[in-house]
């Protein structure tokens, strides 16, 4: 029978688990990226974001998975409205909050 | 480590039904679209159907339509695909495929296939 | 229906460059795909999102995407990259895969 999309979202955030906690050396180097506003339509612009880190490995999958819940096509320099142009984070602080607002939608039953 | 195995093919003549299946272990099943790709012999890849992993849309190429069924039990980490109505030009080796998370799995692209299944439809 | 493009041969010499198209309406504006296939063996994904590479693919592919036309790129071409290679993309609620270019290694 059909399964809840809780199982996707899952996916999603036992990725980001897997890669907090596998980080020895800085997490991409430490490439900056933009902050974003974590509300509505947060998957494509977390993409957005993300996808201008390149020859990063850890992080190829989170950007794969992240396609999936991103209606368009990203490509690298595109940015939304949603993005907090002021503010630039490590990609291991991206990835950390990101986690703990996913956390927090799946806990409440936000899978949409 | 992601395995697909395929079952069910054989040889069927015009007119008849087949059931493939395909069992998937390595990845948590429910959460991934599965596709079924097919190839002709000595012909390209052909897209066959396509079941989300996130709800429980199906989708089908228009050479199948209305003959072919997608389903998949979760229960039981397998993606079946009912065929009825099989034509000569059916005749392919029939991959299961799995595709990506999410309402827009499409967008992941399909990175791990079976071995595939030979259906030949020939009286 | 949507279709895509691809020439059916490629011929390149060992070390030189390949370059596969794929034409499709706006593909640009599309995810791409490609997938390279042996005889006998199950496709494998080489490219993803136009031009990623998924792990244990070799650097030399490459792939773009823009206007209408996706290209796959093999740089420093191997004997062990003679192969059948596949596009694809997503229009309309279906996957469209390419004709199919066979690429050999002279």
């Known amino acids: 029978g059909p399964v809840p999309p809780s199982t996707a979202l899952r996916e999603l955030i036992e990725e980001l688990v897997n890669i907090t906690q596998n980080q020895k050396a800085p997490l991409c180097n430490g490439s900056m990226v933009w902050s974003i506003n974590l509300t509505a339509g947060m998957y494509c612009a977390a993409l957005e974001s993300l996808i201008n880190v390149s020859g990063c490995s850890a992080i190829e999958k989170t950007q794969r998975m992240l396609s999936g819940f991103c209606p368009h096509k990203v490509s690298a320099g595109q940015f939304s409205s949603l993005h907090v142009r002021d503010t630039k984070i490590e990609v291991a602080q991206f990835v950390k909050d990101l986690l703990l607002h996913l956390k927090k939608l799946f806990r409440e039953g936000q899978f949409n | 480590e992601v395995q697909l195995l395929e079952s069910g093919g054989g040889l069927v003549q015009p007119g008849g039904s087949l059931r493939l299946s395909c069992a998937a272990s390595?990845?948590?099943?429910?959460?991934?679209?599965m596709s079924w790709v097919r190839q002709a012999p000595g012909k390209g890849l052909e897209w066959v159907s396509a079941?989300?992993?996130?709800?429980?849309?199906?989708y089908y190429a228009d050479s199948v339509k209305g003959r072919f069924t997608i389903s998949r039990d979760n229960s039981k980490n397998t993606l079946y695909l009912q065929m009825n109505s099989l034509r000569a030009e059916d005749t392919a080796v029939y991959y299961c495929?799995?595709?990506?998370?999410?309402?827009?799995?499409?967008?992941?692209?399909?990175?791990?296939w079976g071995q595939g299944t030979t259906v030949t439809v020939s009286s | 229906s949507y279709e895509l493009t691809q020439p059916p041969s490629v011929s390149v010499s060992p070390g030189q460059t390949a370059s596969i198209t794929c034409s499709g309406d706006?593909?640009?504006?599309?995810?791409s795909f490609w997938f390279q296939q042996k005889p006998g063996q199950s496709p494998v994904l080489v490219i993803y999102?136009?031009?990623k590479r998924p792990s244990g693919i070799p650097e030399r592919f490459s792939g773009s995407n823009s206007g209408d036309t996706a290209t796959l790129t093999i740089s420093g071409t191997q004997a062990m990259d003679e192969a059948d290679y596949y596009c694809?993309?997503?229009?309309?609620?279906?996957?469209?895969f390419g004709t199919g270019t066979k690429v050999t290694v002279l």
């Open positions: 706006k593909l640009g504006d599309k995810y």
């Open positions: 390595g990845f948590t099943f429910s959460s991934y679209a």
């Open positions: 694809q993309a997503w229009d309309s609620s279906t996957y469209v």
């Open positions: 999102h136009d031009s």
């Open positions: 495929v799995q595709d990506g998370l999410g309402p827009y799995f499409y967008n992941y692209g399909m990175d791990v």
């Open positions: 079941f989300s992993g996130w709800d429980v849309s199906t």
